[in-house]
């Protein structure tokens, strides 16, 4: 895919040129993370590469986005899965693929699912296969909330900046 | 589908009535384009029909959205594909469907993929078939950047204002 | 799924504590609705539970969102469908799944589709099955407009707060 691994990226350029003319005078918290393509059997989010960025208070800690201020945020994520080299051997049962954005808040002692998408693919019947999942919605979040993801089918992820990403912005 | 091809659309109505009460006093760049249903073997974006619009500096040139001012934008697109006319001879070979939003910037001499979704369909196996793809994310863009799309499977697009669209808005 | 049915939810907490520090001083109309899991053969939207909320003028009436002020809104929705109980006799007939966000406006005497996603699944061929649909876009809406949804395949919905939802926010 073209444009992968560019340095400096436009994201970095924008940060390096604070006087650059911005459309809107009041910055709002925003973040866009991409899946680290060098980690094939895990999904590690990166903010310092390609089109990824953290702005106006968002931070990335323990693979989670930390909400900088209370308010309503639009939260989104996408994954793309594929299969070819992995072939089901002695089964025609489907492969379960799922991707979830979760909230960990001081209010509750467990992860609350915010966004969930799921798919069964039948790799023995249809091979090669490709599947994309996207979701996003508006949530009322509190300062200090942690946004993270959980994925079933990580070995099948197509890790590139335009296919696997996770982000949020304040409304 | 009801509501397709209405003139004047609400989009046009809003432009024709500048004094109409708006929720928010500061306009921000925003655009929503729809695929031209009269062009069956290409994907041409239109802004002057149905629910489509260009606001506060966005323009459409050479089938690309031109970013009016630097800042963070949420960019999104959807396509719906369908098929029925495949012959049984096509059973073993899948059809590759993909949709990508690309950035062409003065910073790089090529198109950078921002958003990519992909799917393999097996038309002989499952006929008729329908498949939807959607994606969207926040990106730091620069005045003059060009946003365009690339689609694999254009002959299979279901071209209507509610199924095939492309848009962006400043945060 | 953890976190389903929590009371008070963070959404409610935020409403109950108006002095809570918000990221941004100017509230804008926003809404996030979830499908009522207690209604298995219909899709009833709820705003008073889990992560759902109505803010700054949005209201829910006759299962429709009422637009509080004219302007541009980002409108989104997701559904997840699943199936298992089909018998092999069903192999030849696909199941049509679709989800649409519709606009009913004083300008037109019928529902205009804003966002449509569609899928054919072949349950006898691939069982169990799961499928997710998401879409969202920016639209120019007028005070009093009604946003609603229409779904084909309601008995197959996976009704949980993170899988079936519908929302909008002013830009």
């Amino acid at each position: 895919l073209p444009g992968v691994g560019l340095t400096p990226s436009a994201a970095q350029t924008a940060r390096q040129h604070p006087k650059m003319h911005l459309a809107h005078s009041t910055l709002k918290p925003a973040a866009h993370l991409i899946g680290d393509p060098s980690k094939q059997n895990s999904l590690l989010w990166r903010a310092n590469t390609d089109r990824a960025f953290l702005q106006d208070g968002f931070s990335l800690s323990n693979n989670s986005l930390l909400v900088p201020t209370s308010g309503i945020y639009f939260v989104y994520s996408q994954v793309v899965f594929s299969g070819k080299a992995y072939s089901p051997k002695a089964t025609s049962s489907p492969l379960y693929l799922a991707h979830e954005v979760q909230l960990f808040s001081s209010q509750y002692p467990f992860h609350v699912p915010l966004l969930s998408s799921q798919k069964m693919v039948y790799p023995g019947l249809q091979e090669p296969w490709l599947h994309s999942m996207y979701h996003g919605a508006a949530f009322q979040l509190t300062q200090g909330d942690q946004l993270s993801t959980h994925t079933d089918g990580i070995p099948h992820l197509v890790l590139s900046p335009s296919t696997v990403f996770f982000g949020a912005f304040a409304l | 589908l009801p509501g397709v091809g209405l003139t004047p659309s609400a989009a046009q109505t809003a432009r024709q009535h500048p004094k109409m009460h708006l929720a928010h006093s500061t306009l921000k760049p925003a655009a929503h384009l729809i695929g031209d249903p009269s062009k069956q073997n290409s994907l041409l974006w239109r802004a002057n029909t149905d629910r489509a619009f260009l606001q506060d500096g966005f323009s459409l040139s050479n089938n690309s959205l031109l970013v009016p001012t630097s800042g963070i934008y949420f960019v999104y697109s959807q396509v719906v594909f369908s098929g029925k006319a495949y012959s049984p001879k096509a059973t073993s070979s899948p059809l590759y469907l993909a949709h990508e939003v690309q950035l062409f910037s003065s910073q790089y001499p090529f198109h950078v993929p921002l958003l990519s979704s992909q799917k393999m369909v097996y038309p002989g196996l499952q006929e008729p078939w329908l498949h939807s793809m959607y994606h969207g994310a926040a990106f730091q863009l620069t005045q003059g950047d060009q946003l365009s799309t690339h689609t694999d499977g254009i002959p299979h697009l279901v071209l209507s204002p509610s199924t095939v669209f492309f848009g962006a808005f400043a945060l | 799924l953890p976190g389903v049915g929590l009371t008070p939810s963070a959404a409610q907490t935020a409403r109950q504590h108006p002095k809570m520090h918000l990221a941004h001083s100017t509230l804008k109309p926003a809404a996030h609705l979830i499908g009522d899991p207690s209604k298995q053969n219909s899709l009833l939207w709820r705003a008073n539970t889990d992560r759902a909320f109505l803010q700054d003028g949005f209201s829910l009436s006759n299962n429709s969102l009422l637009v509080p002020t004219s302007g541009i809104y980002f409108v989104y929705s997701q559904v997840v469908f699943s199936g298992k109980a089909y018998s092999p006799k069903a192999t030849s007939s696909p199941l049509y799944l679709a989800h649409e966000v519709q606009l009913f406006s004083s300008q037109y005497p019928f529902h205009v589709p804003l966002l449509s996603s569609q899928k054919m699944v072949y349950p006898g061929l691939q069982e169990p099955w799961l499928h997710s649909m998401y879409h969202g876009a920016a639209f120019q809406l007028t005070q009093g407009d009604q946003l609603s949804t229409h779904t084909d395949g309601i008995p197959h919905l996976v009704l949980s707060p993170s899988t079936v939802f519908f929302g909008a926010f002013a830009l």
């Epitope: 992995y86 089964t91 049962s93 379960y96 023995g124 079933d152 | 073993s92 002989g124 | -």
Partner: antibody, heavy 114, light 113 residues
Framework: EVQLVESGGGLVQPGGSLRLSCAAS????????IEWVRQAPGKGLEWVGE????????NYNEEFKGRATFSADNSKNTAYLQMNSLRAEDTAVYYC???????WGQGTLVTVSS | DIQMTQSPSSLSASVGDRVTITCKSS????????????LAWYQQKPGKAPKLLIY???TRDSGVPSRFSGSGSGTDFTLTISSLQPEDFATYYC?????????FGQGTKVEIK
């Protein structure tokens, strides 16, 4: 290295119950179905059923429906087989397997006897 | 349910012999759209778990010696050991993964002559 390790077998009274565990390591557990297969002494292989740990979906051999229950704990990468109303003819080595990759556990012996 | 019938139920052979085991299914295991047969062959030694040898009727699993081969399509399948080795004395099972419930053949025991 990929491993499936069964445990929980042993001597059970007729009419009793037992829960077998299948601990997976060395691969991503949640997306791939875990199958349960048993083998009575000196006999062939018999498929009991399977579970998709991530989704919770199950498929049962009709012969075991009502007596066998599959479950999984994704946080522990472990699948479980609960067998109730055990009879002497349930005496067997119980295996868990991942047919997607072709992995099998070493098996655990269940003896139903008074 | 799909019935799987193996033959012979046992056979005696010597090291170096060519051995053929057949497996018949009561209905076709060929998935027409991708031309794959959902049939696997396993080897089991006493006190051990079954080991996958062949899947999709003819694809050798990684690490399986080339003397093992699978063939056939539809309802008739064959496992061939081109030159029997001492470590090959075991019981062999075919299994269909085409439909539920998964079913196995009754097994073929390969013994030393």
């Amino acid at each position: 290295e990929v491993q499936l390790v069964e445990s929980g077998g042993g001597l059970v009274q007729p009419g009793g119950s037992l829960r077998l565990s299948c601990a997976a390591s060395g691969y991503t557990f949640s997306s791939y179905w875990i199958e349960w297969v048993r083998q009575a002494p000196g006999k062939g292989l018999e498929w009991v059923g399977e579970i998709s740990p991530g989704s919770g979906s199950t498929n049962y051999n009709e012969e075991f429906k009502g007596r066998a229950t599959f479950s999984a704990d994704n946080s522990k990468n472990t699948a479980y087989l609960q067998m109730n109303s055990l009879r002497a003819e349930d005496t067997a080595v119980y295996y868990c397997a991942d047919g997607y990759h072709g992995y099998w556990g070493q098996g655990t012996l269940v003896t139903v006897s008074s | 349910d799909i019935q799987m019938t193996q033959s012979p139920s046992s056979l005696s052979a010597s090291v170096g012999d060519r051995v053929t085991i057949t497996c018949k299914s009561s209905q076709s295991l060929l998935y027409s759209t991708n031309q794959k047969n959902f049939l696997a062959w396993y080897q089991q030694k006493p006190g051990k778990a079954p080991k996958l040898l062949i899947y999709w009727a003819s694809t050798r699993d990684s690490g399986v010696p080339s003397r093992f081969s699978g063939s056939g399509s539809g309802t008739d399948f064959t496992l061939t050991i081109s030159s029997l080795q001492p470590e090959d004395f075991a019981t062999y099972y075919c299994q269909q993964a085409y439909s539920y419930p998964r079913t196995f053949g009754q097994g073929t025991k390969v013994e030393i002559k």
